[in-house]
């Protein structure tokens, strides 16, 4: 099943202590999906979308960006035929970077 879209939601972090907000959206025909956020292949957080909506926002409190690993990806799962879980492809990666200090 198709990959979700992924994006950072503003305000963007300006330091490693700032929170990070990552939105993941499934295609329109998959409302109420279960979403998983990964960083460097490791599970960071799981969220379920409301039954009438197709997206979730992962809210990572300050310090999450210090964790080792690569960019963030998300994935969603839905119940298919025979109540079997079907997983989507992974989203494109999204990277979190911080502004270079001006001093």
């Amino acid at each position: 099943i198709p990959a979700p879209s992924i994006r950072l939601v503003p305000p963007y972090p300006s330091s490693q202590e700032d929170p990070i907000h990552i939105a993941c959206m499934a295609p329109g025909n998959f409302p109420g999906a279960n979403f998983t956020l990964y960083r460097g292949g490791q599970v960071v957080q799981l969220l379920q979308a409301p039954t009438d909506q197709r997206g979730v926002t992962f809210n990572l409190s300050g310090g999450s960006s210090k964790a080792p690993g690569g960019p963030f990806h998300c994935q969603y799962g839905v119940l298919g035929e025979l109540n079997q879980s079907q997983l989507s492809d992974l989203s494109e990666p999204v990277n979190v970077s911080f502004p270079v200090p001006t001093w």
Epitope: V9, P10, E17, D18, H21, A49, G55, V56, T57, G62
Partner: antibody, heavy 123, light 112 residues
């Protein structure tokens, strides 16, 4: 349900500092799904975002007001506060505090508002 | 002058459909940032009407709907009612300068 209530003086003298507090009831200010913000509305005019704060203390300010604004949070009291320095008559407005929602694949909407408090800058 | 441009006023008769536009640029709506809409009845605080371009909070009638295309967004109200007479504001994020949440200048809706 969550409610927000602004408090503070309704009259401030020019060049002084405007100080307001927003008390959150019916829910925790420490939820990861929300920022907490201040918005103002001069009489007969539109809305202007002042700034927002996360429970951890991370702040974001309107660039046009940044040099004069400080927003702080007190999680133990479930409150956040606004300080606006060097005020002039142009800062006369209704000041609202609001909750900023992050969820459903979106973010940044002011989903719950206080009733607003009128602040007049005059000598 | 607001970063997001709205018509100062619109009007319609009861039962009609009206739309309110919100025109931005490539640094806000055109950059795919979420658009939110608010209704402000006279003498009251604004109320969230639409968030994330199209999503209605619980309790908001389905007569209200939002859409977005390119650098513009629209709020549509069908089956206009007298109690819809209010000011309406759009809001988004603008990435120019240091980044900022921005509001449109507001649109006064009159029900004839």
């Amino acid at each position: 349900q969550v409610q927000l209530q602004e408090s503070g003086p309704g009259l401030v003298k020019p060049s002084e500092t405007l100080s307001l507090t927003c008390t959150v009831s019916g829910g925790s200010i420490s939820s990861s799904s929300y920022y907490w913000g201040w918005i103002r509305q001069p009489p007969g005019k539109g809305l202007e975002w002042i700034g927002s704060i996360y429970y951890s203390g991370s702040t974001h300010y309107n660039p046009s007001l940044k040099s004069r604004v400080t927003i702080s949070v007190d999680t133990s009291k479930n409150q956040f506060s606004l300080k606006l320095s060097s005020v002039t008559a142009a800062d006369t407005a209704v000041y609202y505090c609001a909750r900023v929602y992050y969820g459903s694949g979106t973010g940044g909407a002011f989903d719950i508002w206080g009733q607003g408090t009128m602040v007049t800058v005059s000598s | 002058q607001s970063v997001l441009t709205q018509p100062p006023s619109v009007s319609g008769a009861p039962g009609q459909r009206v739309t309110i536009s919100c025109t931005g640029s490539s640094s806000n709506i055109g950059a795919a940032y979420d658009v939110h809409w608010y209704q402000q009845l006279p003498g009251t605080a604004p109320k969230l009407l639409i968030y994330g371009d199209t999503i209605r909070p619980s309790g908001v009638p389905d007569r209200f709907s939002g859409s977005k295309s390119g650098t513009s967004a629209s709020l549509a109200i069908t089956g206009l009612q007298a109690e819809d007479e209010a000011d309406y504001y759009c809001q988004s994020y603008d990435s120019s300068l240091s980044g900022s949440w921005v509001f449109g200048g507001g649109t006064q809706l009159t029900v004839l």
